[in-house]
């Protein structure tokens, strides 16, 4: 058993049928010695008397808010949550496996640049009685500071019969140098509590590996005289790290017909312009990627050929 | 990525082309190592990230762009005299570089070159003959060092009398390649910045 926060405790249980559970001793936070009784949640049934209460915690029915009273007055509370260990592996009932980029990915994180700011998000089908708390650091043995905000509900989607809820959080490394070469990964830890169930999820990454630039901005077409060709131009996104000559991007320009089946023409360039043939009803799209370290491509920025 | 390769024009900052080749070569070598050594811990998540140049060179600090010198987090160990030698600068005037930058890059390359050669000698003794260092990568390191044209003492190749532990050597190769790729990215960024200055 360990303390999650003041008066909230997590009991770790080896979770299998007929398991013996864990013996827990609760102590009433009071100078009083006599006439103390204990109850669980809203029940008025007295579970025991005395300054300490010993319970055998086996199932969720044994978890909840234990309260000690004296003469009708509440003295203190202890909330017990359960953390299930199923065959040596902590349960992951609360969050959905996003399966991207690999199986057992519960937290996904992205950064728009090298400033040390990043966003993480996760999915769940649970709509109520759900709380999250996020902590982060650079490295784990001698952790350096990363400050995270509160997790917020950022999207709701319908998937088949289920509603899916997306939560996200923004974090910022306290003293980040965009040019630094990372040798210790960022660690992100999310505590999730659903009713009386506690779970924790972690992700470990280097900022360089989660970079995903914003799409190029100001995408424009300039027709070339007496030709089907157009000059496409664009600019670096505002959110990208500066100076751009140091934090350079590379670009992919794509001409896509109206039908998805039509052949796509693609050109790769390090410049912020390209000359392409503009077909009728086609659209031109441009996306960006760090020129030197191949992390994710940005989303496409698009304009119609017409 | 199979991108069209742009050939530099003769007036271009001489080292940019070499640094691009370096990054391409080390990335290819790392990819090859990860595939060949699939049963070894060779991915970024599995290895310890060690920098053999730590406390010996200060490339990131010495080569910091002017725009980032206002960022206190970037100024841990910054030294502040400006570069005037090294053939890569050609005749370009630049107030951005410090004396350490290009020589620091040269020292990095020299240290990695020694490590890789020592490691290759060990790998050649492996009866499994599982992996060797790409000669192209070693050649590209050499070319960039020549282009940098700094004179420094030759570092003798380390020789070891004891029987090599091939498992440890292959893990060390992965660690070295990951670290060298990160340094090659920094070198490429620096050369690109210098080229634009």
């Amino acid at each position: 058993i360990w303390e999650l926060k003041k008066d909230v405790y997590v009991v770790e249980l080896d979770w299998y049928p007929d398991a013996p559970g864990e013996m827990v001793v609760l102590t009433c936070d009071t100078p009083e010695e006599d006439g103390i009784t204990w109850t669980l949640d809203q029940s008025s049934e007295v579970l025991g008397s005395g300054k300490t209460l010993t319970i055998q915690v086996k199932e969720f029915g044994d978890a909840g808010q234990y309260t000690c009273h004296k003469g009708g007055e509440v003295l203190s509370h202890s909330l017990l949550l359960l953390h299930k260990k199923e065959d040596g592996i902590w349960s992951t009932d609360i969050l959905k496996d996003q399966k991207e980029p690999k199986n057992k990915t519960f937290l996904r994180c992205e950064a728009k640049n090298y400033s040390g700011r990043f966003t993480c998000w996760w999915l769940t089908t649970i709509s109520t009685d759900l709380t999250f708390s996020v902590k982060s650091s650079r490295g784990s043995s001698d952790p350096q500071g990363v400050t995270c905000g509160a997790a917020t509900l950022s999207a709701e989607r319908v998937r088949g019969d289920n509603k899916e809820y997306e939560y996200s959080v923004e974090c910022q490394e306290d003293s980040a140098c965009p040019a630094a070469e990372e040798s210790l990964p960022i660690e992100v830890m999310v505590d999730a509590v659903h009713k009386l169930k506690y779970e924790n999820y972690t992700s470990s990454f280097f900022i360089r590996d989660i970079i995903k630039p914003d799409p190029p901005k100001n995408l424009q077409l300039k027709p070339l005289k007496n030709s089907r060709q157009v000059e496409v131009s664009w600019e670096y996104p505002d959110t990208w790290s500066t100076p751009h000559s140091y934090f350079s991007l590379t670009f992919c320009v794509q001409v896509q017909g109206k039908s998805k089946r039509e052949k796509k023409d693609r050109v790769f360039t390090d410049k912020t312009s390209a000359t392409v043939i503009c077909r009728k009803n086609a659209s031109i799209s441009v996306r960006a990627q760090d020129r030197y370290y191949s992390s994710s491509w940005s989303e496409w920025a698009s304009v119609p050929c017409s | 990525r199979n991108l069209p390769v742009a050939t530099p024009d003769p007036g271009m900052f001489p080292c940019l082309h070499h640094s691009q080749n370096l990054l391409r070569a080390v990335s290819n070598m790392l990819q090859k190592a990860r595939q060949t050594l699939e049963f070894y811990p060779c991915t970024s998540e599995e290895i310890d990230h060690e920098d053999i140049t730590k406390d010996k060179t200060s490339t990131v600090e010495a080569c910091l762009p002017l725009e980032l010198t206002k960022n206190e987090s970037c100024l841990n160990s910054r030294e502040t005299s400006f570069i005037t030698n090294g053939s890569c600068l050609a005749s370009r005037k630049t107030s951005f570089m410090m004396a350490l930058c290009l020589s620091s890059i040269y020292e990095d390359l020299k240290m990695y070159q020694v490590e890789f050669k020592t490691m290759n000698a060990k790998l050649l003794m492996d009866p499994k003959r599982q992996i060797f260092l790409d000669q192209n990568m070693l050649a590209v390191i050499d070319e960039l060092m020549q282009a940098l044209n700094f004179n420094s003492e030759t570092v003798p190749q380390k020789s070891s009398l004891e029987e090599p532990d091939f498992y440890k050597t292959k893990i060390k190769l992965c660690i070295l390649l990951h670290a060298f790729r990160i340094r090659a990215v920094t070198i490429d960024r620096v050369m690109s910045y210098l080229n634009a200055s």
Epitope: Y16, E86, N103 | -
Partner: antibody
Framework: QVQLVQSGGGVVQPGRSLRLSCAAS????????MHWVRQAPGKGLEWVAF????????YYADSVKGRFTISRDNSKNTLYLQMKSLRAEDTAVYYC????????WGQGTMVTVSS | SYVLTQPPSVSGTPGQRVTISCSGG????????VKWYQQLPGTAPKLLIY???QRPSGVPDRFSGSKSGTSASLAITGVQAEDEADYYC????????????FGTGTKVTVLG
């Protein structure tokens, strides 16, 4: 004490269907994940499928994906394995088992796929 | 399709020490815990070892388990005639959990 009693096995022709049941008693069935495991005659153990305690997530071996469906009725304390498009290679003793560090197995039920 | 490899058979005379190996990889045995089962002919498997080296109550202390890196082993010290059975190791793969990974199985024969 914990008990898992299986039923529903038998002889079936290739391409046909069969449903296996596993009745649980002696524990809070709705709190625990459950597996199906099979063993072809003279061969080793092969995992078939898993279902979460609340039925929200199901996982299958590649060899049965799209043909077998694991389900549970927590009000009846029963686990099911619906097997469709049966093949000769599905011939095996099928076991249900609880998920956890200490597990309990059903007695097994024989499924023979033969024309 | 078995990724956990066991020797097909091992044998020993009563009282001898018999060991069965189970070889896996970094993503299974290297990352998760190992169980061992005993299966007597015509019966369901019986749990002998969980959590690499833990014995459930009722399992004789002549059975012991261990794990090192990407391999695990089961030792029977002072093998007895009633230990003649098939033995299976079981683990998970960190990417496909909760799918069970079983070893290929080892037939233990008690001679004489």
């Amino acid at each position: 004490q914990v008990q898992l009693v299986q039923s529903g096995g038998g002889v079936v022709q290739p391409g046909r269907s069969l449903r296996l049941s596993c009745a649980a008693s002696g524990f809070t069935f709705s709190s625990y994940g459950m597996h199906w495991v099979r063993q072809a005659p003279g061969k080793g153990l092969e995992w078939v499928a898993f279902i979460r305690y609340d039925g929200s997530n199901k996982y299958y071996a590649d060899s049965v994906k799209g043909r077998f469906t694991i389900s549970r009725d927590n009000s009846k304390n029963t686990l099911y394995l619906q097997m469709k498009s049966l093949r000769a290679e599905d011939t095996a003793v099928y076991y249900c088992k609880t998920h956890g560090s200490h597990d309990n197995w059903g007695q097994g039920t024989m499924v023979t796929v033969s024309s | 399709s078995y990724v956990l490899t066991q020797p097909p058979s091992v044998s020993g005379t009563p009282g001898q020490r018999v060991t069965i190996s189970c070889s896996g990889g970094r993503s299974n045995i290297g990352s998760t815990t190992v169980k061992w089962y005993q299966q007597l002919p015509g019966t369901a498997p019986k749990l002998l070892i969980y959590g690499n080296d833990q014995r459930p109550s009722g399992v004789p202390d002549r059975f012991s388990g261990s794990k090192s890196g990407t391999s695990a082993s089961l030792a029977i010290t002072g093998v007895q005639a009633e230990d003649e059975a098939d033995y299976y190791c079981q683990s998970y793969d960190r990417g496909t959990h909760p799918a069970l990974l079983f070893g290929t199985g080892t037939k233990v024969t008690v001679l004489g």
